[in-house]
Every structure is written in structure tokens, then in C-alpha cells.
Amino acid sequence: ASNFDCCLGYTDRILHPKFIVGFTRQLANEGCDINAIIFHTKKKLSVCANPKQTWVKYIVRLLSKKVKNM
């Protein structure tokens, strides 16, 4: 659910880390209405996810670790 590159809501699905190549943080105080994590998938889709949810934090942590180890 995004409009002009802003997420307007969150996915109600859970994604596997193997499906995700990267993410972008959306901050509510930078021109968008809500905080969000935008996951970029291997199918070239952008998925808006709730940064408070455990599965989202888990994937963000995994991807951040990967970047650190590069």
C-alpha cells in the first residue's frame, strides 16, 4: 500500500528473508504519514511492513548483519 513512494498501510502477510534483497526505512517525520519498512523482494516488488512487528525486526536485523559483514 504505497502512494508517491509513501507507505499508507502495512502488509498482512509474513515474508521469508530468502525473498528479500534489501529494505528502505520510511520515517513519519520525513514527509510520509507512517513509519514503515519497505522490503524490496526478488520479484522486484516493494512491500510495506510494520517496523514494530517481530518478523519485520528479525529480517531488518538479518539484512543489517549481512551488510556489516560485507
Epitope: L15, H16, K18, F19, K42, Q53, W55, Y58
Partner: antibody, heavy 120, light 107 residues
Amino acid sequence: QVQLVQSGAEVKKPGASVKVSCKASGYTFTNYWMHWVRQAPGQGLEWMGVIDPSDSYTTYNQKFKGKATLTVDTSTSTAYMELSSLRSEDTAVYYCTRGNYGVDYAMDYWGQGTLVTVSS
Amino acid sequence: DIQMTQSPSSLSASVGDRVTITCGASENIYGALNWYQRKPGKAPKLLIYGATNLADGVPSRFSGSGSGRDYTLTISSLQPEDFATYYCQNVLITPYTFGQGTKLEIK
């Protein structure tokens, strides 16, 4: 050791509701998801939905939206699955199963199953 | 939703045989696949996670392989306790979906 102990078999009339419990022990309840899976007679396994006990976030298989409600009581490390407006096709064995994203999102421990029979 | 198709749906084999069960996804699931064993009257048991990784306590005669849309469970030398029904499961994205099962019977 990890254990998931489910409530006993239930026989219900069509239109009634049933609430199945799943008591977890041997691990930190809030660190793992709890999935619910069913197997109807002569059928395969069917994923119903999942709850994250740390924040009660749920997501459901579309087929079970409005039919199943997943909840948890973290004080007793118990997960619940309530089925409403029961019909004969809801007759099945219902399993709770721990979701472990440390092992590739697999369901690594299962309850013994609860048979729900819907019959008039 | 992602569809999972197993073959064969049933299979007769003898103790000591090498057995292969295949699972096909309706789209690429990038190795997000698990295998379970279910015996009558018992809860399913995790065998393989992440397409290739053996779960704790599972004998090494079980192995998993595959990528993309096509996956395989192999039992290198069947033992009497292996006669059961086997299910593959997609965990790429909810709703998680299972194959219809492969029933392994004694010949």
C-alpha cells in the same frame, strides 16, 4: 524439553463454537510464533494462521478469516484457537505448532492434536 | 497463493530401498521449503528445513535438495519406521501451503 499440550477432543453441534487450548513449556513462549494447522479426515495438512505471542500480531489464511480467532495468554504460556459457526466440514484434527524463524521459519514442535467433531 | 504439488501421491517400497519424493511449487520459492513426516495418530514431525537442512534428531538417511520451483526428499535406505506420509511446505510468504502428501507404504 519443549512441549505443546493441547486440550482434549470436543464434540459440538452445528452453529456452536469451540475453543482449543495449547499449553507451551520448555522454552520462552514469547520468542516463537504459534501456528495452527488442521487435518480433516482423509485430507492433507492445511495452515490456518499464526500468532506472535510477543505482541498478539495475527495473520490468517483467507479461508479461515472470520472462522478462526487466535489468542494467547502469556501469563500461562497458552495459545488458543476459537472456531465459530461450526459446520460438519470443520470436523478435523487441529494442531498447534511452534514457528521457529531460527530454523528457516519451520514448525519444529507440534502439539498432540485435538479432534473436533461437528455433528448434529 | 503458492500451490505445492507432490509426486507421487503414494509409493510402495521395500526396506533398504532408496526413495525419492518430489515437490513442485507454482512459482519460485527460493529454497523456503520444509519437509514433514506424519504417522497415523501422531503429530507431524519436522524432517528438513530450508530445503536442505536436517532437523535435530533426524537420521542422516534423510536428505533434501532442490531450488527454484523443484524440490526433492530422498531416503537413502528405507527403514521400517520410515513408512509414513510425507508433506512439503512452502514458507516463502503467508498463507503457508502444504503439498497434498505422499504416502509411503511397504511393498
